[in-house]
């Protein structure tokens, strides 16, 4: 069945670029030889001319573009909104396990509070910021949070009598933290415990606000050139032989989208290790792995290691009692 | 044991999470947007598929369009004479992917190493030394409100862990999404969708 | 008494390297984080570089990255600052300061007196 | 990273107050992190007057104030004295958790 005859008055082809362009006077009144097509290239009269291939090359591109944009919407949406949801929700736990921690310290400790109450507020802040991609090491932020306390709970709870702390006892104080292991192996479970969760919850928001970059990056892509005269040949050159109603044959779309796209689908195998390896990672965000467990849980942990300090204080008075003698003699003065 | 601070549940938000008849917990969530995510797996695979069947082509028509004449739908021209003396399709895959797709392979690259010397091996998730450190004192099964906790004395049931998702303000279901729906199916390897898209011939 | 004193400061030629020292005495040094500020001639404060209580983290301004390494010997309570690929812009008085947290930077309350270094040909 | 923004002086006579402010961004004075003041008289190292944005060191007199609100700081000093002419620098620090600190302001007591 041989082609219809084109359009003898380019009508049709003038109405629908219209459409495209309005107001511009670009399309031939009649069949020309469109000599200088360089996309439509004519098998004989032809209601094209270059200025209109011209213009048909950049809409081809930006259909290309909108369908991209309509084709990532959903993974778009999804991914952007669990980033934002989860990103809230372990902040929402930090608040929470920072409240459960000073509930713990007004409830059992109340001479400790005012001090306690700033300690673990930094402490939960680092946390925060870890979170959110901060370089802080974990097992500095553990060190500190007890470092801190340590001098507090000595000078308000173990030796009470001193007189109001001055820098040098409470130096001297931090240092024997360390020095005499006074919490015991407590801080170790609680490094540990918190870098696993913490780190694991970090690379998954990481991996989150990768997979947004991913998805931006196809959605903003700019077609090459070449492509811009495939689609253009595909969806428009029909036009100008004045076949409006005609479509573009399914394997040839096929074909010209694989070129077209010969890039992008590059991706596609790391797109699938992406969310298989995520899978993989959540999958094993539970007990120590996973924050919430640890982080809600860690008031108690500090209450047992303060119970530890307790529990051992006669002797720690004792040693600390000589080991920074020289700090309390210079105090009483 | 740690006096269990059940005086922090003033907070109201809190307060309307012990009533919420969806009870969600983070890692719940988690596993829910893996599911959904899994659904995308071949998007990039499917994306040629997926313009063409959002774009117009010829699907009940005898004739359609292939680049250069109007030929019959399953005729060998049909995808293969637009390709001819125009210019070379192979040379286009060639190329290879612009700077910004290198760039973006790269990072993939990079998060999926990270992912995975962070994932915990099936059956370890307990280190040795945490579970002589009494991590896992107590009994408390995992089905259970989960034990938290370091010592046996200490330890201390944190109910249902919280349910924080139920706190948040704003709900996060995909088909609420703004705009037309779309989906991933994984069976056929197509995304099927209806949007239209403008200034489509 | 808490102290903390600079030293190796001097008169150095572009493109050359200097090593800064800073002895502290008087506090827990392993349990903070030390930075590095200079103060070029009747210029403001600038932050150079800071480092963690541990050493595990260590932080750089942009115009010295690449080209200073901080770093500390908490069994000597020292900190150090090497200065490579010296600039005229370098020039200024340099102070090393204690932090009053550990395990990054928050608010520096100690400070030395400050070494001088003069990148000239 | 780019220094906070603080006003190059402000003057008062003894007795009056004088208020400085220092504006960020959200990543620095913004966000999670504290502001600390600082004061300096010529030739000699700065001095730790705020730290955690209205905290003050033991020593430090309750004429000087701090506060923080949204990516702005601020310092009073009220009840000004002669000694308090200085040059005063706010400090935070980034999201990288790197060091920023402000212009600097010189203040001037009058009379």
């Known amino acids: 069945q041989p082609p219809p005859p084109p359009d003898a008055t380019c009508h049709q082809v003038r109405s629908f670029f219209q459409r495209l362009q309005p107001g511009l006077k670009w399309v031939p009144e009649t069949p020309v030889p469109g000599s200088d097509l360089q996309v439509c290239l004519p098998k004989g009269p032809t209601c094209c001319s270059r200025k209109m291939e011209e213009k048909y090359q950049l809409t081809a591109r930006l259909n290309m573009e909108q369908l991209l944009q309509s084709a990532s919407m959903e993974l778009k949406f999804l991914i952007i909104q669990n980033a934002a949801v989860f990103q809230e929700a372990f902040e929402i736990v930090v608040r929470h396990a920072k409240n459960y921690t000073n509930a713990m310290f007004k409830n059992n400790y109340p001479s400790l509070t005012p001090q306690a109450f700033e300690f673990v507020g930094e402490f939960f802040t680092d946390v925060s910021l870890y979170i959110l991609g901060s370089d802080i090491n974990v097992d500095d932020m553990v060190n500190e949070l007890f470092d801190s306390l340590f001098p507090v709970i000595y000078t308000q709870m173990m030796n009470p009598g001193l007189p109001e702390s001055v820098l040098d006892i409470n130096e001297c104080l931090r240092g024997a933290r360390r020095d005499l292991k006074v919490f015991g192996s407590f801080p170790k479970l609680i490094m540990t415990q918190v870098s696993k969760s913490l780190q694991v919850t970090r690379i998954f928001l990481q991996a989150l606000n990768l997979g947004i970059e991913v998805i931006n990056t196809t959605d903003h892509l700019k077609f090459s050139k070449d492509c811009g005269r495939m689609l253009t040949r595909m969806w428009y050159c029909s036009y100008c032989q004045g076949l409006m109603m005609v479509k573009p044959c399914g394997g040839y779309c096929n074909v010209v989208m694989q070129g077209c796209m010969a890039g992008v689908v590059e991706i596609d195998k790391y797109w699938r290790e992406y969310i298989l390896s995520l899978e993989e990672l959540v999958n094993g965000m539970y007990r120590i792995y996973d924050m919430e467990n640890v982080l809600l849980g860690l008031f108690s942990t500090i209450h047992d290691s303060i119970q530890y300090v307790q529990k051992n204080g006669g002797k720690l008075t004792t040693t600390i009692g000589k080991l920074c003698a020289h700090s309390q003699q210079r105090q009483y003065r | 044991s740690a006096y269990y601070p059940e005086d922090l549940f003033i907070d109201k938000k809190i307060l309307k999470v012990a009533h919420v008849e969806h009870e969600e917990t983070l890692s719940s969530r988690r596993r829910e947007l893996i599911q959904k995510l899994k659904s995308f797996i071949n998007f990039y695979s499917a994306l040629p598929g997926y313009i063409c069947s959002h774009s117009p082509v010829a699907e009940n028509d005898t004739l359609c369009w292939n680049g250069q004449e109007l030929v019959e739908r399953y005729s060998q021209k049909a995808a293969r004479n637009g390709m001819k003396n125009q210019f070379n399709l192979h040379e286009l895959k060639m190329k290879g992917p612009e700077p910004v797709v290198s760039q973006i392979i790269d990072k993939l690259k990079h998060i999926n190493q990270l992912l995975r010397t962070m994932s915990v091996p099936k059956g370890k998730v307990l280190d040795k030394s945490l579970d002589e450190e009494g991590l896992e004192s107590g009994d408390c099964g995992d089905d259970e409100d989960e034990c938290i906790g370091s010592s046996g004395d200490g330890m201390v049931k944190v109910k249902n862990q919280l349910r924080f998702l139920a706190e948040l303000a704003y709900d996060l279901d995909v088909d609420d999404a703004p705009g037309n729906k779309q989906h991933g199916n994984q069976k056929d390897n197509e995304i099927t969708t209806s949007h239209s898209v403008g200034n489509m011939p | 008494q808490v102290q903390l004193q600079e030293s190796g400061g001097g008169l150095v030629q572009p493109g050359r390297s200097l090593r800064l020292s800073c002895a502290a005495s008087?506090?827990?040094?392993?349990?903070?984080?030390m930075h590095w500020v200079r103060q070029a001639p009747g210029k403001g404060l600038e932050w150079v570089s800071a480092?963690?209580?541990?050493?595990?983290?260590?932080y750089y301004a942009d115009s010295v990255e690449g080209r200073f390494t901080i770093s500390r010997d908490n069994s000597k309570n020292t900190l150090y600052l090497q200065m490579n690929s010296l600039r005229a812009e370098d020039t200024a008085v340099y102070y090393c300061?204690?932090?009053?947290?550990?395990?990054?930077?928050?608010?520096?309350?100690?400070w030395g007196q400050g070494t001088l270094v003069t990148v000239s040909s | 990273q780019s220094a906070l923004t603080q006003p190059p002086s402000a003057s008062g006579s003894p007795g009056q107050s004088v208020t400085i402010s220092c504006t960020g961004t959200?990543?620095?004075?913004?966000?999670?992190?504290?502001v600390s003041w600082y004061q300096q008289y010529p030739g000699k190292a700065p001095k730790l007057l705020i730290y955690?944005?209205?905290n003050r060191p033991s020593g430090v007199p309750d004429r000087f104030s701090g506060s923080k609100s949204g990516t702005s700081a601020s310092l009073a000093i009220t009840g000004l004295q002669a000694e308090d002419g200085a040059d005063y620098y706010c400090?935070?620090?980034?999201?990288?958790?790197?060091?920023?600190f402000g212009g600097g302001t010189k203040v001037t007591v009058l009379g």
């Open positions: 300061a204690k932090d009053r947290r550990g395990s990054h930077a928050d608010a520096l309350n100690v």
């Open positions: 008087g506090f827990t040094f392993s349990s903070y984080a």
């Open positions: 480092i963690s209580s541990s050493g595990r983290s260590t």
């Open positions: 959200s990543s620095d004075v913004g966000g999670y992190n504290y």
């Open positions: 955690g944005n209205s």
């Open positions: 400090q935070s620090y980034d999201s990288s958790l790197r060091v920023v």
